[in-house]
């Protein structure tokens, strides 16, 4: 499973769960819940530490009769870090044992680096839109945890579905768009 | 099929205000996004503003202070308002459609204002 | 602050295949979308890819769009070019969900 492996294709559907409007003026982030994924691919590129994967994704967001005409582009981080302090370690047979002894107690994971706000705009079958705020990623990195660190890296499958957010000023034009946020 | 007409003053004096109007015809401003874009004589594009498709505008941060746009539906048109002309506000402006984000791209293009800032 | 870099201008010979580049200064570009636009002296601008790589109705396949991770930037391929596609080209994206624009590349057929 190289970093240099051939593309392939990924995308998957988010269902964004509505919640209690508000008068913000701007799109808020969302806090917690879950979303729903189909059709995955996925493509490679090589620019973090050594098993630690940036693969590319896209997702349609769908919410109920709205949803986006293109999809959303952001990264996943997978794979298993092997930083290259510890590749010789690895590597070399007779260190084997060294390398697992240490992994023992410690372990380097592919997680989040580097996080962007982003806008996307579903069109509903009436002819409405609707408006969400949504955190993509866009790099990973590799991060060391202690072996009771419990901590589990952010990725598109804990990521958290819309919050809607009316804006006040829609409501007084009585417009049928809305807006949303989601992380 | 899709259009996108700018109209307005071709000449505008120093310190006055620019008002412009954007006629779109074959499609919904409730389903696209309508920027306004400009373009100094030999130079690149500048995006000045959006009126999205909900109604929500946003401005380019270094235009934000002298310029508001808004929009009719019931007539099908966009109008752009600019305060305090100075003669770099000498500019061809163009009203374009935007697709819905992301993506996004800027599908339609009208022909473009030419507007001159002098006395 | 997200910036698109366009090299000023480029030469090219007549059926010849040239690949003008638009860089981004930050992230990861195969998360964002690149569009690209030609235009004519005094006329309006027209698009001739968008989403990264794809072609709007009319426009030549000769003309293809492309994505580098490697160096972070789009690329504009015209295969066989001809003397109309003498013009400037611009790229385009949005950080967040405000456009940005590269600085143009004015294409010289020779």
């Known amino acids: 499973f190289k970093n240099d492996a051939t593309e392939i294709l990924y995308s998957h559907v988010v269902k964004p769960v509505p919640a209690h409007p508000s008068s913000n003026s701007t799109l808020n982030q969302a806090r917690n819940g879950g979303r729903h994924f189909s059709n995955t691919g996925l493509d490679r590129n090589t620019r973090v530490q050594v098993g630690c994967r940036e693969l590319r994704s896209t997702k349609y967001i769908s919410d109920g009769q709205c949803t986006s005409i293109s999809p959303l582009k952001e990264l996943v981080c997978a794979g298993e870090c092997l930083p290259l302090p510890v590749l010789p370690n690895w590597i070399g047979g007779g260190y084997g044992t060294k390398y697992w002894s240490r992994r023992s107690s410690q372990e380097w994971r592919c997680v989040n680096d580097k996080t962007r706000t982003q806008r996307i705009q579903l069109q509903c079958q009436d002819g409405s839109t609707r408006t969400y705020k949504i955190t993509v990623v866009t790099a990973c990195k590799c991060k060391r945890y202690t072996r009771q660190h419990n901590e589990s890296s952010h990725n598109f499958e804990s990521m958290s579905p819309a919050k809607p957010v009316q804006h006040h000023r829609e409501r007084k034009r009585a417009s049928k768009s809305s807006k949303h946020s989601m992380s | 099929q899709v259009q996108l007409m700018e109209s307005g003053p071709g000449l505008v004096q120093p310190s006055e205000t620019l008002s412009l109007t954007c006629t779109v015809s074959g499609f919904s401003l409730t389903s696209y996004n309508v920027h306004w874009v400009r373009q100094p004589p030999g130079k690149g594009l500048e995006w000045m503003g959006v009126?999205?498709?909900?109604?929500?505008?946003d401005y380019n941060s270094a235009l934000k202070s002298r310029l508001s746009i808004r929009r009719d539906t019931s007539k099908n048109q966009v109008f752009l308002k600019m305060n305090s002309l100075q003669s770099e506000d000498t500019n061809t402006y163009y009203c374009?459609?935007?697709?819905?984000?992301?993506?996004?791209?800027?599908?339609?293009w009208g022909q473009g204002v030419m507007v001159t800032v002098s006395s | 602050q997200v910036m698109l870099t366009q090299p000023k201008s480029v030469s090219t010979s007549l059926e010849s295949t040239v690949k003008l580049s638009c860089k981004l200064n930050s992230d990861n570009i195969g998360t964002y979308y690149i569009h690209w636009y030609q235009q004519h002296e005094g006329r309006s601008p027209t698009t001739m890819i968008y989403?990264?790589?794809?072609?709007p109705d009319g426009v030549p396949d000769r003309f293809s769009g492309s994505i580098d991770s490697s160096s972070n930037s789009a690329f504009l391929t015209i295969n066989n070019v001809q003397t109309e596609d003498e013009a400037i080209y611009f790229c385009h994206s949005y950080d967040d969900h405000i456009p940005i624009f590269g600085g143009g590349t004015k294409l010289t057929v020779l």
């Open positions: 989403g990264d790589d794809k072609r």
């Open positions: 009126l999205w498709s909900d109604g929500d505008t």
């Open positions: 374009v459609r935007g697709g819905l984000l992301p993506g996004g791209y800027f599908d339609y």
